[in-house]
C-alpha cells in the first residue's frame, strides 16, 4: 500500500539553554523532490505551527530568518532543532511531512515528541 | 473568526468560461493548502483541485484537468478557480475549503452554485 | 486513486439510539488519514472526524471514530434530533483526495 509513515522520538529534554533537537524520519512511498516539513505544537488540545520549511532534496532546510527552528536533512531524515525554549513551551511537538512534488502529494504525520523545558536556577548572588 | 467566503457563481453556457473566488479571513491564509471541493445536485462531495501555501504546488481532479486552473493571491488572502470549456457536468455548487493542521478539510465555506446550461 | 465505500446507503432510526456507519477502503495505509464530515440540506459539510478517531473541535462526544487498515467507523451513541444528516468519509493522506458516496441518516 502507499502510505507515508512518519517517526521521531517519543520524548527529548531541552538543555539547559533553551534548545531541544530530534530527528523527524519518513518512509517516501515515491520519489519526491520537494518536502515540507512542519513542526506542530499540540497543548491543551490547542495546535499551533511552529516552524515551516521546503527543501529541495538534495539541498539544506531553509526556515525563515525570525523562525526558532533550525534543521539538516540527510535523505528522509531530517534533524530538527528548536531554540529559546522556556518552560512554559513544554508540549507535543509534532512533525508534518508532505510530499509537495512531483504529483502525487503525500502527507504524514507522526505521533509527536513530548519536549520537556526546564527553566534554569537563576545564578545566586555571589561577593568577590 | 476564521471564515472562508464563496463568489461568483452564476448562469453560464456549455463551451464559456467563468472565475469563482474565495475569501479568507481570520487565519494566516498563507500557511494552509486550499482547495476545491464540488457537489453536483444530489450528489456526493467531489474533490475537484488544491493549491498549497506559496501557490507554486497544485494538483486536480482527472475530470477538469487541462480545463480548470486553480490560483491564489496571498496578499490579497483569496483563492481563485478559473473555469474553461465548462459542460453539464459541472453544474454543482462549489466549495472552497482549508486543509487544516494535520490535513483534514477543517473549514469550509458557504458554496457558490455554478450552472452550465444552454 | 483510493475509492471509500460506505453502508448503509440510509440508516432509518429514532433520536436516541445508537448510529453506526461504516466506510471501507480500496487500500490500506490511510488509516492515519480518514475523515468524518456532517451535511445538513443547504449547509456546507462540517468536519466531525480526522486521523480515524481524533474528534474536531467543537465536536460533542457522542460522535466517536475507529478503525484501521481498511475498515472505519463513525459512531453516534445517542442521536439527537440535529444529528440527522449526511455523513461522508473522505481519506486526505494522498491525491486525489477522495471521499465515499455518503450514508443518510434520517428519521424512522
Known amino acids: 500500500c502507499k502510505a507515508m509513515h512518519v517517526a521521531q522520538p517519543a520524548v527529548v529534554l531541552a538543555s539547559s539553554r533553551g534548545i531541544a533537537s530530534f530527528v523527524c524520519e519518513y518512509a517516501s512511498p515515491g520519489k519526491a523532490t520537494e518536502v515540507r516539513v512542519t513542526v506542530l505544537r499540540q497543548a491543551d488540545s490547542q495546535v499551533t505551527e511552529v516552524c515551516a520549511a521546503t527543501y529541495m532534496m538534495g539541498n539544506e532546510l531553509t526556515f525563515l530568518d525570525d523562525s526558532i527552528c533550525t534543521g539538516t536533512s540527510s535523505g528522509n531524515q531530517v534533524n530538527l532543532t528548536i531554540q529559546g525554549l522556556r518552560a512554559m513551551d513544554t508540549g507535543l511537538y509534532i512533525c508534518k511531512v508532505e510530499l509537495m512534488y512531483p504529483p502525487p502529494y503525500y502527507l504524514g504525520i507522526g505521533n509527536g515528541t513530548q519536549i520537556y523545558v526546564i527553566d534554569p536556577e537563576p545564578c545566586p548572588d555571589s561577593d568577590f | 473568526q476564521v471564515q472562508l467566503v464563496e463568489s461568483g457563481g452564476g448562469v453560464v453556457q456549455p463551451g464559456r468560461s467563468l472565475r469563482i473566488s474565495c475569501a479568507a479571513s481570520g487565519f494566516t491564509f498563507s500557511s494552509y493548502g486550499i482547495h476545491w471541493v464540488r457537489q453536483a445536485p444530489g450528489k456526493g462531495l467531489q474533490w475537484v483541485a488544491v493549491i498549497w501555501y506559496d501557490g507554486r504546488n497544485k494538483y486536480y481532479a482527472d475530470s477538469v484537468k487541462g480545463r480548470f486552473t486553480i490560483s491564489r493571491d496571498n496578499s490579497k488572502n483569496t483563492l481563485y478557480l478559473q473555469m474553461n470549456s465548462l459542460r453539464a457536468e459541472d453544474t454543482a455548487v462549489y466549495y472552497c475549503?482549508?486543509?487544516?493542521?494535520?490535513?483534514?478539510?477543517?473549514?469550509w465555506g458557504q458554496g457558490t452554485m455554478v450552472t452550465v446550461s444552454s | 486513486e483510493i475509492v471509500l465505500t460506505q453502508s448503509p446507503g440510509t440508516l432509518s432510526l429514532s433520536p436516541g439510539d445508537r448510529a453506526t456507519l461504516s466506510c471501507r477502503a480500496s487500500?490500506?495505509?490511510?488509516?492515519?488519514?480518514l475523515a468524518w464530515y456532517q451535511q445538513k440540506p443547504g449547509q456546507a459539510p462540517r468536519l466531525l472526524i480526522y486521523?480515524?478517531?481524533s474528534r474536531a473541535t467543537g465536536i460533542p462526544d457522542r460522535f466517536s471514530g475507529s478503525g484501521s487498515g481498511t475498515d472505519f467507523t463513525l459512531t453516534i451513541s445517542r442521536l439527537e434530533p440535529e444529528d440527522f444528516a449526511v455523513y461522508y468519509c473522505?481519506?486526505?493522506?494522498?491525491?486525489?483526495?477522495?471521499s465515499g458516496p455518503g450514508t443518510k441518516v434520517d428519521i424512522k
Open positions: 486521523g480515524a478517531s
Open positions: 475549503s482549508r486543509s487544516g493542521s494535520f490535513g483534514a478539510f477543517d473549514i
Open positions: 487500500q490500506s495505509g490511510s488509516s492515519s488519514y
Open positions: 473522505q481519506q486526505y493522506g494522498t491525491s486525489p483526495f477522495t
